[in-house]
Interface confidence: low
């Protein structure tokens, strides 16, 4: 293959101009002409000067891995993938995410000591013991309250995730 | 090895004309243009016209009224005819190959061809 | 049309001594589509370098050429007999090809 530049590619013995970003090659340049360059058309892209034939295909970012659609595609930038809400991503993909994952919910007797975040799934905690969370929120855990005056005995003993009345 | 053959040196009368020939072996004119270039005594180089591998030609616009490029790929051989002579066109002609590197430059020069224009 | 200035027209150099010749431009062309030829005398031109900087085939590594724009140079490192000859610069950034009107470099 012959040394070509920086701004042209090979083809076959010969270097041809490159095309833009936003274009592919059409033809290739000839003895009269210089590269023929046509636009990527919707759906796909190309970020660089290239020498390619086809434009590459927008990825897709399918709710069904936790994925929504953070930067549309345009014909010079492909599109970037965030979590949905309530989602944290579990496998990163250079400056975007690939999958996420839906936030862990806080069990009955757990509350929830820091909130997910998109790259950080929820962090619970376990109520200390005479407290209780019903909810698993970001509430503190609630002290159990004391059995009302008329009821004669306790049904039973408290535990963390709920109260006997 | 690519060669480039010209036809022999002549002496024209000013206002005839001039034809030369050019057989190129090596390679493919289907492949490859031809340029034509000449050099007038003690001067430097001047370039005349091309034709291209598909049969069109360029021509430099001094000489587009008077100059005619043609070629039979089957034969190898591409022809170059040059009308109302004057003692001015006096020069070596050469033919050259337009290669296919950086900037396409001719690659292969024929031996050039010798042609006087006097009376 | 595009018109190459090749300077000096004639140079007498020593073996060994570093050679520069230079071509300008009157306009603007892409360095890819500018090229040196070698003639001798009683002989076809050669191409020597091709789209500025890239040297032919068989050409020594003492050669070089460089530029951009409108301002183009070869360079010899060390001058040596067999480089005594006529060098053309010429475009091909649009028509009409044009060419230089030659340096002629002679050894001393």
């Known amino acids: 293959l012959p040394s070509c530049k920086e701004d042209e590619y090979p083809v076959g013995s010969e270097c041809c101009p490159k095309c833009g970003p936003g274009f592919h090659v059409r033809q290739a340049c000839g003895e009269q002409t210089g590269t023929v360059c046509e636009p990527c058309s919707p759906g796909t892209y190309i970020a660089h000067f290239n020498g390619l034939s086809k434009c590459l295909q927008c990825q897709m970012c399918d709710p069904a891995m936790g994925l929504r659609t953070s930067r549309n595609c345009s014909t010079t930038a492909n599109a970037l993938c965030g979590c949905s809400p309530g989602h944290f991503c579990i496998i990163q993909d250079g400056d975007h995410c690939a999958a996420c994952r839906a936030y862990a919910t806080s069990s009955p007797g757990q509350r929830v000591q820091k909130g997910g975040t998109e790259s950080q799934d929820t962090l619970c905690q376990n109520c200390p013991p005479g407290t209780f969370s019903s909810n698993g929120t970001l509430e503190e855990c609630q002290h159990g309250t004391k059995c009302s005056k008329w009821l004669v005995t306790e049904a039973g003993p408290g535990t963390s995730s709920f109260r006997w009345v | 090895q690519v060669q480039l053959k010209q036809s022999g040196p002549g002496l024209v009368q000013p206002s005839q004309s001039l034809s030369i020939t050019c057989t190129v072996s090596g390679f493919s004119l289907t492949t490859y243009g031809v340029h034509w270039v000449r050099q007038s005594p003690g001067k430097g180089l001047e370039w005349l016209g091309v034709?291209?591998?598909?049969?069109?030609?360029d021509y430099n616009p001094a000489f587009i009224s008077r100059l005619s490029i043609s070629k039979d790929n089957s034969k190898s051989q591409v022809f170059f005819k040059m009308n109302t002579l004057q003692a001015s066109d006096t020069a070596i002609y050469y033919c050259a190959r337009r290669g296919y590197n950086k900037g396409y430059a001719m690659d292969y020069w024929g031996q050039g061809t010798s042609f006087t224009v006097s009376s | 049309e595009i018109v190459l200035t090749q300077s000096p027209a004639l140079m007498t150099a020593s073996p060994g001594e570093k050679v520069t010749i230079t071509c300008s431009v009157s306009s603007t062309i892409s360095s890819r589509n500018l090229h040196w030829y070698q003639q001798k005398s009683e002989a076809s031109p050669k191409p020597w370098i091709y789209?500025?900087?890239n040297l032919a085939s068989g050409v020594p590594v003492r050669f070089s050429g460089s530029g951009s724009g409108t301002s183009y140079s070869l360079t010899i490192s060390s001058m040596e007999a067999e480089d005594a000859a006529t060098y053309y610069c010429?475009?091909?950034?649009?028509?009409?090809?044009?060419f230089g009107s030659g340096t002629k470099l002679e050894i001393k």
């Open positions: 034709i291209w591998s598909g049969g069109n030609t």
């Open positions: 789209g500025t900087s």
């Open positions: 010429q475009q091909w950034n649009s028509y009409p090809l044009t």
